[in-house]
Every structure is written in C-alpha cells, then in structure tokens.
C-alpha cells in the first residue's frame, strides 16, 4: 500500500490556514470536491464541498471554511479562517467520484492550531475576522448528496457570507512552485 | 427503498464469538459508511465502530478495540460485524445503522438482532 | 469521549401540550463549517431508533414539522410544538463531532 505522506502546518489561533490542493486537470476539473477531516482512529469526516458540477473559480463558504476550485490550474484552494485550537488535525482534499471511494489528493495536511498572538508578519488575526464574516449555523446539508437520500426538510437560508475580497484573487504563473505553500496575509 | 436486513437472533455461551451480519438494499452501498450500536436490555444506545464499505476500512470504539471485527462483501451489499471473547454483559440487540461522510445522521437503521450471552 | 447529559430523565405529557428535552455535551460540538454535530433519535417501544434531526437543527425526511431542534456549542434543544400520542419513547442526543456518543434518554410518555 502506499504511504501516506503528510504536510505539517503550525499556525496561531485567528490565522488563516490557505492551502492548495493539485489534480489532474483533464480527469476532474469539473468533479466535485471535498475538504475532509481525519481524527485520529476515525474515518474521514466531509466538512465542506464544491457544487456539483464544480465551478470555475466560485468560492464556496462553509462556516469558516472557503473552497475555491481553479479549473485552468487543476487547482482547489482550501481557506479556513480564523482558526481554533480545536481545528487540529489531519486533514485532506478529495475529488467525488460515486459510487467509488474519493480520490485522495497528495498529501495530507497536519494542522497545529495553537493559542496565542504570535506577534509576527505571519500573524492575522485582525485582518481574518475583518475580512471574512462568518455566517451562523446553516440548515442545508452539508454537501450535495449524490445518490438517492432522504431530504432535508428545510430550505437553506441565503448566505451572507462575502467572499469577494481582494484576497480571493490568486494569481498563477509557476504553478508547481506554489502547491501547498501557506498564505499568512 | 433503502432497507438495512439483519441476520437473526443468537445465543452465545461466554468466551464464544458472535458474527451478525447486515444486508443492504435500496441505495448504493459503497457510498456511505455502516455503523454499529449496541442496546443492553434496558438500557441506552452504545456506539460501537463504523465500516467504509467502499475501501473496507473500520474505526472502532475504544471499548470494543481488539474484540470488534467489522468487514464487508461488496457482492452482496452486505456488512458484518464480529464480536469476540463474550460476556454476559454483552447481551444485547445490536443494529446497523448508515451514516454518510458529508454527515446527514444515522438515516436508515437495522431490525436489530439480539445476542444473549449465557452460560 | 464527548459526554452527553440529558434531561429530564422522565418526562410526562399532555397530548396538544408542548414539550422539550435538553441535551448538553462536556465539549462543544460546532465545527469549523458552522455546523452542530449533534443528532436527535427517538426510538418508539419496540422498535429501532429513528432519525429526527441531525447537525443541530435539521430535520430529517418524513419527520413532521412539530419537531424542531436548537443550540449551539455545548447546549441543545429538542422541542415539541404539540405533542402527539405516537411521540412516545425515548430520545437520545447524540454527537458526532468527535468518536460518536450518546445521551442517557429521555423517556416521554403520556401522562
């Protein structure tokens, strides 16, 4: 089997975890995509997804977490906000494929959340809860579902959720060089 | 429609092992997760562990580490759930229950099979 | 493991009259996406458990609207607007934000 390999990132409560997650551009630019939880022992746990189709470039924003899926680059961005201590964990991309088991995205992503003002140019804590307003718990499922199931009963409310910041403007030009770098704004 | 069809009741004597089994129907079983909780006679509801039907892979409750076994057939859309070394305390009705990896609830659960643990 | 307390242990009702159970977690249960990973299941005597709400304040499919879930962190609320004759049984909270435990049950039954 192969080994899975992980990326580690320590990051202070209030900051931003922004990560990259690369694919195969002509197999699943338009499949949808998933961020996924792994606590330790347990199985991989969806917190947020893209559209199905996935969209070009339309930010999708769970809670404090925003997806954004760049097709021309083969590329999901991973954005969670304001980070928690209890954020930590592993963590990792997938691409639905249904029925089959999700593709995993290389690799898998180590985050320590720790509490804190670091003090540093890393830190961001103000601009993170500035930027982002953080919408109240939803009612929709958490993703869309993709087989037959039972459906929720209550429509989901509008989100209120602004991310149309300059800060969702990513430039590429040497995409390789970028894969998993962390962002500190 | 989605049905979850479990194997029927058992008696096991203490030290012994016990195998139920859960059938799936009505939806692609590959695509969500299988979970087991256990009810002791009168009392309340205990997570055991889940399986992936899809790739196999398991996570079991701390309690029940080393005496749980939970596999799948994929052929038969069927999960099984092992458990070894009884004791009387062990009695109880098990059930399956199918959970999803996006998370909506255990939505469909089992009849529930009871296992009598007695010497 | 999360611990999850409910009450009352009992709760005697009156058919049309509103009711309402409590369930509170030893740690919060909001996730990083917004959502409470707390599930509400009744199981009527005799028989299986059956979803009634699941992340907080959902409403699972075919479960009339008199049932509502609420709360947030570590406090959670399952009311019934009006309950009814075959609203009796148990109801468990349960958790899933970490490795999935249950409340202890909160018994209805008609008064």
């Known amino acids: 089997a192969t080994k899975l390999t992980e990326e580690k990132y320590e990051l202070k409560e209030g900051q931003t975890l922004d990560v990259k997650c690369d694919y195969t551009l002509e197999k699943f630019a338009s499949s949808q995509k998933a961020w996924q939880i792994i606590r330790d022992g347990e199985m991989p746990k969806t917190l947020a997804c893209t559209e199905r189709p996935s969209k070009n470039s339309h930010p999708v924003q769970v809670g404090r977490i925003i997806l954004e899926d760049y097709h021309d680059h083969g590329l999901l961005r991973v954005r969670m906000v304001n980070l928690q201590v209890e954020d930590s964990g592993l963590y990792q991309c997938v691409i639905y494929q249904p029925p089959k088991e999700p593709h995993m995205l290389f690799d898998r992503i180590r985050l320590v959340v720790t509490k804190g003002f670091s003090g540093t140019p890393g830190s961001n804590e103000n601009s993170t809860q500035n930027v982002y307003k953080i919408p109240p718990t939803t009612t929709k499922a958490l993703c869309p579902l993709y087989t037959s199931p039972r459906t929720v009963t209550q429509a989901p409310p509008k989100s209120t959720a602004d991310v149309s910041t300059p800060d969702s403007e990513i430039n590429l030009t040497n995409v390789t060089d970028i894969i998993r770098v962390p962002v500190f704004n | 429609q989605v049905q979850l069809v479990q194997s029927g009741a058992e008696v096991k004597k203490p030290g012994a092992s016990v195998k139920v089994s859960c059938k799936a129907s009505g939806y692609t079983f590959t695509s969500y997760y299988m979970h087991w909780v256990r009810q002791a006679p009168g009392q309340g509801l205990e997570w055991m562990g889940v399986?992936?039907?899809?790739?196999?892979?398991?996570s079991y409750a701390q309690k029940f580490q080393g005496r749980v076994t939970m596999t799948r057939d994929t052929s038969t859309s069927t999960v099984y759930m092992e458990l070894s070394s009884l004791r009387s305390e062990d009695t109880a009705v098990y059930y399956c229950?199918?959970?999803?990896?996006?998370?909506?609830?255990?939505?469909?659960w089992g009849q529930g099979t009871l296992v009598t643990v007695s010497s | 493991d999360i611990v999850m307390t409910q009450s009352p242990l009992s709760l005697p009702v009156t058919p049309g009259e509103p009711a309402s159970i409590s369930c509170r977690s030893s740690?919060?249960?909001?996730?990083?996406?917004?959502?409470?990973?707390l599930d509400w299941y009744l199981q009527k005597p005799g028989q299986s458990p059956q979803l009634l709400i699941y992340l907080g304040s959902n409403r699972a499919s075919g479960v009339p609207d008199r049932f509502s879930g609420s709360g947030s962190g570590t406090d959670f609320t399952l009311k019934i607007s009006r309950v009814e004759a075959e609203d009796v049984g148990v109801y468990y909270c349960m958790q899933t934000r970490h490795t999935p435990t249950f409340g202890g049950g909160t018994k209805v039954e008609i008064k």
């Open positions: 740690q919060s249960l909001l996730h990083s996406n917004g959502y409470n990973y």
């Open positions: 229950a199918r959970g999803a990896d996006y998370y909506a609830g255990f939505d469909y």
């Open positions: 399986i992936n039907p899809s790739g196999g892979s398991t």
